[in-house]
Interface confidence: low
């Protein structure tokens, strides 16, 4: 039967099985979330987009799922990231008491997956899904990440850290999820400071990227929200990770 053709790739194959399996695995590895009923989680996830026009998804659609996946990160332990997901995840795998959104249940469930449905059918569209630029921004995947990112930022407290990619032309990009959602949803009454870690790409790059105009723009936005701002250059990300693993290493006493 005829399906609308979208510009983006279709739902990830075996999407329901993947979400359910990830949920079960997460609750096994994190006994604190054992109270979560994974079947209910999947039902709520499915309910957010199945049988709905995939360019008309709202944050409200995801509220039942968000409620089931309620989780709080201890103060000072939130790590945001922008355009440098792999290093952020490598870091939290080593520094086990810090958490990115993808270390939380809902982020873990959806990481690297694509999904969408069709209006008035109970089928998942495995052929194509709306592209954020070419089709529409209110698609199931984009709205999901906007919703959970907003919630993740809202619940952060203490000193919040963000990892930024110093190799990009816009180190801080106002159009990224971090720049458009998370920055604006940090709560000044709970968040004392935002500390940016600018990750350098080149081995010989000794510039102070904390002076970059986009970082200054970020500092301005944050300061206007009555949140203090700090910035650090991470000149050697490989050494940085090694020193997180083994802080006693003598070479870790020098700068990273």
């Amino acid at each position: 039967r005829w399906r609308q053709q979208w510009s983006g790739s279709g739902t990830t194959s075996r999407f329901p099985e993947t979400v359910l399996a990830r949920c079960v695995k997460y609750t096994e590895v994190h006994p604190e979330m054992r109270h979560v009923d994974c079947q209910s989680v999947w039902d709520a996830f499915k309910g957010a987009f199945i049988s709905k026009y995939p360019c008309n998804i709202t944050e409200e659609d995801y509220q039942p799922l968000v409620k089931l996946g309620t989780q709080t990160v201890p103060c000072n332990k939130t790590l945001l990231w922008s355009r440098i997901k792999d290093l952020a995840h490598q870091f939290t795998q080593v520094q086990r008491d810090m958490f990115t959104l993808e270390d939380m249940l809902l982020g873990y469930l959806a990481d690297d997956l694509t999904w969408c449905g069709e209006f008035n059918t109970f089928e998942i569209n495995y052929q194509s899904c709306p592209d954020w630029r070419k089709d529409c921004s209110n698609n199931p995947v984009s709205v999901f990440w906007k919703t959970v990112s907003r919630r993740f930022a809202e619940t952060a407290c203490g000193v919040v850290h963000v990892m930024l990619n110093g190799s990009r032309s816009k180190i801080f990009d106002k159009n990224s999820t971090f720049g458009s959602v998370e920055v604006h949803n940090l709560q000044p009454e709970k968040v004392q400071a935002l500390e940016a870690w600018v990750i350098h790409g080149g081995r010989e790059d000794s510039r102070d990227l904390c002076q970059d105009p986009t970082i200054k723009e970020l500092e301005s936005i944050i300061s206007k929200r009555n949140i203090r701002f700090f910035c650090k250059n991470i000149y050697r990300p490989d050494k940085f990770l090694q020193c997180v693993k083994n802080p006693e290493d003598s070479s870790c006493l020098s700068g990273i």
Epitope: E28, V29, P31, E32, T70, T72, V73, P74, D97
Partner: antibody
Framework: QVQLVQSGAEVVKSGASVKVSCKAS????????MHWVKEAPGQGLEWIGY????????NYNQKFQGRATLTADTSASTAYMEISSLRSEDTAVYFC?????????????WGQGTLVTVSS | DIVLTQSPATLSLSPGERATISCRAS??????????MHWYQQKPGQPPRLLIY???SRATGIPARFSGSGSGTDFTLTISPLEPEDFAVYYC?????????FGGGTKLEIK
Amino acid sequence: QVQLVQSGAEVVKSGASVKVSCKASGYTFTSFNMHWVKEAPGQGLEWIGYIYPGNGGTNYNQKFQGRATLTADTSASTAYMEISSLRSEDTAVYFCARTGGLRRAYFTYWGQGTLVTVSS
Amino acid sequence: DIVLTQSPATLSLSPGERATISCRASESVDSYGNGFMHWYQQKPGQPPRLLIYLASSRATGIPARFSGSGSGTDFTLTISPLEPEDFAVYYCQQNKEDPWTFGGGTKLEIK
């Protein structure tokens, strides 16, 4: 610092109910599970279950399901355990206990214990 | 349910000696690289105190004379050398699967 303060000892008649409270302080109450553990005389320790105050989610040991009810009042940072249809084998010290949080699911903090004595 | 069997039930030793307490699980409590086995010490009239978590990691403030080892189904708590304040009841506990279960306890008494 983290503190869990439980209500005082109770003497209750067989067949009745008892509700033990556990007031938490020194941390964000809604961020951590509150567990309950039973220590019957000469019987060792038995896990009853836990509640996640953040969304009211509970998980019970099947053995206690139906007779134990775990609730939480987030405004008072207090967790409760109610046991109904009490019988003599429910005579025990009941502890509330908190784990270390995500990826740290072991009992780091304990209340002082509440002795419940079931009389006939 | 995963049954934890502790041995011995009672251990009589003198200060300065080595105490070895065993905990055997009815099935493996390993998951994703961790042994979900923890050890507690309990003294009369007090709540238990966490000693060792995830099989071998010492909890904050626990002296180095306490150590944990093991994986799969067999775990050991070792205390060496014994100090007078170490005489108490020791419990192992697993949380790999619901319901979380405790061993029957080992009473460590002064000889």
